[in-house]
Amino acid sequence: KKVVLGKKGDTVELTCNASQKKNTQFHWKNSNQIKILGIQGLFLTKGPSKLSDRADSRKSLWDQGCFSMIIKNLKIEDSDTYICEVENKKEEVELLVFGLTANSDTHLLEGQSLTLTLESPPGSSPSVKCRSPGGKNIQGGRTISVPQLERQDSGTWTCTVSQDQKTVEFKIDIVVLAFQKASSTVYKKEGEQVEFSFPLAFTLEKLTGSGELWWQAERASSSKSWITFDLKNKEVSVKRVTQDPKLQMGKKLPLHLTLPQALPQYAGSGNLTLALEAKTGKLHQEVNLVVMRATQFQENLTCEVWGPTSPKLTLSLKLENKGATVSKQAKAVWVLNPEAGMWQCLLSDSGQVLLESNIKVVPTW
């Protein structure tokens, strides 16, 4: 007998073909011999089965000897053996209906777990294989678990249910609630305006919650809260902000903070947290601020950086159009009795300049 797999809530066509391409009598029955539908004259008649109001047939195909039954809004309990009686012969079709659903909300925070549960008819022994948008493959039986969701797990998961060498495909949209980046670093010269941006890796119709930026300055012994804010329907409103520094915050998404001036005492790292309404847990993004200062005091030209820099970064002082250079994998470099001219202080990572500050040394007569 033929096996057909269907999806819960979906529509399925069970085919039944007569050898002669002409309109003839036919009936569809279930395994209990209860009539579902059939032909009487040119009229489609429905029987007393529970399926009748969801079953249909295409009159336009009867002339071609095709007497299929279409079942809409499939339920797991529609799984059964259906019998098509046409031309004094019986065709049997076994219909197996499966459902695959996420146990919780499909909008999950990064790090949370996802469980997919398979609903299947009694007596079936299906296998399930799911593929994440990032190409991760997970296999299972009645349940599939993804212990720790990552940003790249956001999107459409494709799950294939297999039974009796037949397959049916489910698509489940999963939204991982996270910031686009786990961490970002802003490099600024002293005195420059600093822009911090915290774009989200998802979009929601209504986005409501509250957030806070905690800051650990390199020079400070403890961290402090720089700003707290509310988010209501994608509108941002500041609740509380420190006096020093006096941060400004954009009223619309993406979350955007402006520090009027980059100063050495602000260099350090922060953690922006966002708690979303009706969600347990918080979204996090780390942000770092590196500040550069170039100064000349008496016969000493100094370049310094403050903030979280990796040991492999190079700090250099270089005289423009001249070979004179001093470089160190350190947070400060200096030149004694520097030549007159335009000096450049460069913070580089493997030759790529991250930050640059120019200082003019005037000749001393």
């Epitope: 999806k7 809530g9 529509t11 066509e13 009159k59």
Partner: antibody, heavy 115, light 107 residues
Framework: QVQLQQWGAGLLKPSETLSLTCAVY????????WSWIRQSPGKGLEWIGE???????NYNPSLKSRVTISVDTSKDQFSLKLSSVTAADTAVYYC?????????WGQGSLVTVSS | DIQMTQSPSSVSASVGDRVTITCRAS??????LAWYQQKPGKAPKLLIY???SFQSGVPSRFSGSGSGTDFTLTISSLQTDDFATYYC?????????FGQGTKLEIK
């Protein structure tokens, strides 16, 4: 609730091939047949043809020699190609879902054939 | 092909009126007939199928009847929203065919 969204070139020259695609959102793609219908002031509503998930097609005999309907089940999309168009093919083209009746329709695409 | 002929091609009526539109098939189609409503710039909308069954969400002032070759669509009490063009369609055999339409206008 199922939604059908269609797109394709709107202005063609005679002898070119008309190409339209329809995407199905929020409903079952399997079990149904997916049709193309056109509407012109001269000929009213005219059924062009249909396809199902497994690629089985039925065409209007009056257009059969020029029509190809194809399906991409991975995207829940189906497409219409009508070759060697003339000014008589100028119409609003609709995609629609059907078992016996057209119960869901696309927004329509105006296709103009002009030299 | 089965020809579907609608009459009248246009009708003028007032709010509250009872309106009947007829559709005749060139050969017997039992009850394999549907009625659609279309407003300017929009796609047709299914009102009645199987000659007399209501599509969900369709107001009860719309009703369909008939079998074989002669069918009618009746609007018991016209509302402003009902002024549109109405089409019948047969699903008895390929190719599916439509009537030429009946335009319902405000008197």
């Amino acid at each position: 609730q199922v939604q059908l969204q269609q797109w394709g070139a709107g202005l063609l020259k005679p002898s070119e091939t008309l190409s339209l695609t329809c995407a199905v959102y929020g409903g079952s793609f399997s079990g149904y047949y997916w049709s193309w219908i056109r509407q012109s002031p001269g000929k009213g509503l005219e059924w062009i043809g249909e396809i199902n998930q497994s690629g089985s097609t039925n065409y209007n005999p009056s257009l059969k020699s020029r029509v190809t309907i194809s399906v991409d089940t991975s995207k829940d999309q189906f497409s219409l190609k009508l070759s060697s168009v003339t000014a008589a093919d100028t119409a609003v083209y609709y995609c629609a879902r059907v078992i016996n009746w057209f119960d869901s329709w696309g927004q329509g695409s105006l296709v103009t054939v002009s030299s | 092909d089965i020809q579907m002929t609608q009459s009248p091609s246009s009708v003028s009526a007032s709010v509250g009126d009872r309106v009947t539109i007829t559709c005749r098939a060139s050969q017997g189609i039992s009850s394999w007939l549907a009625w659609y409503q279309q407003k300017p710039g929009k796609a047709p909308k299914l009102l009645i199928y199987d000659a007399s069954s209501f599509q969900s969400g369709v107001p009860s002032r719309f009703s369909g009847s008939g079998s074989g070759t002669d069918f009618t669509l009746t609007i018991s009490s016209l509302q402003t929203d009902d002024f549109a063009t109405y089409y019948c369609q047969q699903a008895n055999s390929f190719p599916y065919t439509f009537g030429q339409g009946t335009k319902l206008e405000i008197k």
